[in-house]
Amino acid sequence: QSSLTPLMVNGILGESVTLPLEFPAGEKVNFITWLFNETSLAFIVPHETKSPEIHVTNPKQGKRLNFTQSYSLQLSNLKMEDTGSYRAQISTKTSAKLSSYTLRILRQLRNIQVTNHSQLFQNMTCELHLTCSVEDADDNVSFRWEALGNTLSSQPNLTVSWDPRISSEQDYTCIAENAVSNLSFSVSAQKLCEDVKIQYTDTKM
């Protein structure tokens, strides 16, 4: 990756990520420096026939740092504070090559739920107010509602009217996604409206 266009890399909170380094084949490499937000992370003197010299210079991330055979950076047990700008500088006998990365740490989506507030009108039309949510949602989570493969809404909330006399059985699916995971949850309009109908008739009696 050239320094002008950083490679966007997504990592999952608590898991591992690799920032891939294109090691110059056949060249004499003096050293590789890895930087995080312009602070030195590691200084590596690579070797072909013996073990490389690896000097980890950032104690905070040190224990979670590792390097592949081609000196790509591996970071394990990812934390939110690992988010930021990473750079690798490869110094060879002929030039200095720079690779840039932007690491974004995202949570694996968990516990998708749909809450509903439904109303039954006197004409027997059922109005569904559906709200989709996931645990620890942040700005990186997107929601959409689908029915029969069509997107009805690109928000967590969906309001639909369902008339059992003219509508066939209908499922509404909420899809929650971020760059590293997606979850879905489907609800049946008929089932939800039947539940409302039972409540309605119970209160009438």
């Epitope: 056949g26 003096n30 072909e48 013996k50 110094s91 002929t94």
Partner: antibody, heavy 118, light 107 residues
Framework: QVQLLQPGAEVVKPGTSVKLSCKAS?????IYWINWVKLRPGQGLEW???????????NLNEKFKTKATLTVDTSSSTAYMQLNSLAFEDSALYYC???????????WGAGTTVTVSS | DIQMNQSPSSLSASLGDTITITCRAS??????FNWYQQKSGNIPKLLIY???NLHTGVPPRFSGSGSGTDFTLTISSLQPEDIATYYC?????????FGGGTKLEIK
């Protein structure tokens, strides 16, 4: 033990070419770079270039780009440097040297004295 | 190209003396800096590699130091066998360049 064997001397005519050899023994020839260095009396050492025997890739000092050609024969563990269009100023002692991965010359050949004489 | 300015070009010292030879690079070098000793009629012999590391078998009276553009070879307690020409070499970038050499003589 690790050795680089070079012939002692070559006497050549101006305008001709000469191919100097450097035979390695005692180590895996294909994994260490071989460098060539020129020594002229009263002029000090001058780096000519290097070659990786396993990969065949070379790097030449710009000054020697049209003068020197580096090759290897892995079957005989020998590195070669051909010097062409020889002139009197090419008269010198030419060393081959093995380069360690920490980028220093740890083993040297005894050198070949090239004399350009009409 | 990185130019290596080595000084002095010649040096006369007494046995037991401590002497220093300096190489100044035309641009910064990280650690790829070496020192060689060449005795008359012999091949160059590595003394110091990567600025300050003593090569196997080299007496500890030889030491190397420096960073950036200025590098030094120090020989303490000068011995008769130290009579030679000393060269610095930068192997940081192509083309590799040697210093002009320092001819050491005993008074």
């Amino acid at each position: 033990q690790v050795q680089l064997l070079q012939p002692g001397a070559e006497v050549v005519k101006p305008g001709t070419s000469v191919k100097l050899s450097c035979k390695a023994s005692g180590y895996n020839f294909t994994i260490y770079w071989i460098n060539w260095v020129k020594l002229r009396p009263g002029q000090g050492l001058e780096w000519i270039g290097d070659i990786h025997p396993g990969r065949g890739n070379t790097n030449l000092n710009e000054k020697f780009k049209t003068k020197a050609t580096l090759t290897v024969d892995t079957s005989s563990s020998t590195a070669y440097m051909q010097l062409n269009s020889l002139a009197f100023e090419d008269s010198a002692l030419y060393y081959c040297a093995r380069e360690d991965e920490d980028w220093y010359f740890d083993v040297w050949g005894a050198g070949t004295t090239v004399t350009v004489s009409s | 190209d990185i130019q290596m300015n080595q000084s002095p070009s010649s040096l006369s010292a007494s046995l037991g003396d401590t002497i220093t030879i300096t190489c100044r690079a035309s641009q910064g070098i990280s650690i790829w800096f070496n020192w060689y000793q060449q005795k008359s009629g012999n091949i160059p012999k590595l003394l110091i590699y990567k600025t300050s590391n003593l090569h196997t078998g080299v007496p500890p009276r030889f030491s190397g130091s420096g960073s950036g553009t200025d590098f030094t070879l120090t020989i303490s307690s000068l011995q008769p066998e130290d009579i030679a020409t000393y060269y610095c070499l930068q192997s940081q970038s192509y083309p590799y360049t040697f210093g002009g050499g320092t001819k050491l003589e005993i008074k």
